[in-house]
């Protein structure tokens, strides 16, 4: 049976630059050597959040009983093959990439659910899964058709540290402003009713003839 | 330095069951595939199975699936073969054989082999 | 499943002769075959791996060519060490067949 790919072994690629060319790509996809084919689905195409991140599940169809498996995103734009990121787990394990990856991802049997944060509008492009069955022999190999991932830049807007400095400020102005407001008020009444002096409560006659019973105290300073 | 160390000789009687064992060291047990495989004497090599000890899993070739059983023993670090129901056939060495990580695959160590006599 | 067909499966041959075996399976391996020599009471020693590279170890008079359903393996100049039973094996899916053996003899 004649596989999509190549065997690593083989055709090992310098990713130091981590950028195919479009010939190595046509080698890749379509060139029949070296391992067996397996069938990889993905989605075709995913929105990513306005934060930037797109998840997306990529299903092989495994024909052994494989105990290592490797996984690959490539993201294929301008005739240019990427690979993204990359991770080997062993079945039943967590799916580790490098700390540093801008991928994570959890396996769960043939389905590898595949996260990638911090995308902008200009990573925008066609994402590949590329499965390898890597343990035990014999080796497969499958590529999925690719997942589109489009990123919407959201709309430019202040930032949200920013507006909460602003916020901050004028908060304690205003707390700042009421202070004085009412430690100016508190002193300007003092003012009126020094200078302090001592008096005597006093029973007056009311003013109003209906009220006779009744008497309103009234305070009368004495010098 | 890797090592699969396995018994000299077994003998046992006809209709019995011998289990046989396959002792590794120098290597990680639980992550390569061991494999076993039956030689008759003056005769070629045949694949019996694998078995990956992490987890138990097992592929049998079709012609052992009712003769023979594999298993591990991870704290051990040991592989067992067991054949069942003895016939004459079954006299032959059995080798251990562990299968390497690296594309292309090949048995890149191998047992001394355990000579297993079935006799009445 | 694959089946291997080796030949000869026997040679007689002389110290410091070239020879050849050659091993056909029953469906492409694209090179995913192995060759063990073994020595009378001793476990199979492996030869050559993905048709093509030399184990370590290996004298470099041991060498390996082929692909598709044709495989051999060349002794270019025979030292008496040589003298034992070939096999090659597949790996490209389960079960892992071997060839039926060469045994390589003394002329």
């Known amino acids: 049976m004649a596989c999509l790919g190549f065997q690593r072994h083989k055709a090992q690629l310098n990713l130091a630059t981590r950028t195919w060319p479009c010939t190595l790509l046509f080698f890749l996809l379509f060139i029949p050597v070296f391992c067996k084919a397996m069938h990889v689905a993905q989605p075709a195409v995913v929105l990513a959040s306005s934060r930037g991140i797109a998840s997306f599940v990529c299903e092989y169809a495994s024909p052994g009983k494989a105990t290592e498996v490797r996984v690959t995103v490539l993201r294929q734009a301008d005739s240019q093959v990427t690979e993204v990121c990359a991770a080997t787990y062993m079945m039943g394990n967590e799916l580790t990439f490098l700390d540093d990856s801008i991928c994570t991802g959890t396996s769960s049997g043939n389905q590898v659910n595949l996260t990638i944060q911090g995308l902008r509008a200009m990573d925008t492009g066609l994402y590949i899964c590329k499965v390898e069955l890597m343990y035990p022999p014999p080796y497969y190999l499958g590529i999925g058709n690719g997942t589109q991932i489009y990123v919407i830049d959201p709309e430019p807007c202040p930032d949200s540290d920013f507006l909460l400095w602003i916020l901050a400020a004028v908060s304690s102005g205003l707390f700042f402003y009421s202070f004085l407001l009412t430690a100016v008020s508190l002193s300007k009444m003092l003012k009126k009713r020094s200078p302090l002096t001592t008096g005597v409560y006093v029973k007056m006659p009311p003013t109003e003839p209906e009220c006779e019973k009744q008497f309103q105290p009234y305070f009368i300073p004495i010098n | 330095e890797v090592q699969l160390l396995q018994a000299g000789a077994v003998l046992a009687r006809p209709g019995t069951s011998v289990k046989i064992s396959c002792k590794a060291s120098?290597?990680?047990?639980?992550?390569?595939?061991m494999n076993w495989v039956k030689q008759r004497p003056g005769k070629g090599l045949e694949w019996i199975g694998m078995?990956?000890?992490?987890?138990?899993?097992?592929s049998l070739n079709q012609a052992f699936k009712d003769k023979a059983k594999l298993t591990a023993a991870t704290s051990a670090s040991i592989a067992y073969l067991e054949f069942s129901s003895l016939t004459n056939e079954d006299s032959a060495v059995y080798y251990c054989?562990?299968?390497?990580?690296?594309?292309?695959?090949?048995?890149?160590?191998w047992g001394q082999g355990t000579l297993v006599t079935v006799s009445s | 499943d694959i089946q291997m067909t080796q030949s000869p499966s026997s040679l007689s041959a002389s110290v410091g002769d070239r020879v050849t075996i050659t091993c056909r399976p029953s469906?492409?391996?694209?090179?995913?075959l192995a060759w063990y020599q073994q020595k009378p009471g001793k476990a199979p020693k492996l030869l050559l791996y993905?048709?093509?590279n030399l184990a370590d170890g290996v004298p470099s008079r041991f060498s390996g060519s082929g692909s598709g359903t044709d495989y051999t393996l060349t002794i270019s100049s025979l030292q008496p060490e040589d003298f034992a039973t070939y096999y090659c094996?597949?790996?490209?899916?389960?079960?892992?067949?071997f060839g039926q053996g060469t045994k390589l003899e003394i002329k």
């Open positions: 054989a562990r299968i390497g990580r690296r594309n292309p695959y090949y048995f890149d160590y």
């Open positions: 120098g290597y990680s047990f639980t992550t390569y595939w």
């Open positions: 078995i990956h000890p992490s987890d138990s899993e097992t």
């Open positions: 469906e492409n391996l694209y090179t995913n």
């Open positions: 993905g048709a093509t």
């Open positions: 094996q597949h790996l490209w899916g389960t079960p892992f067949t």
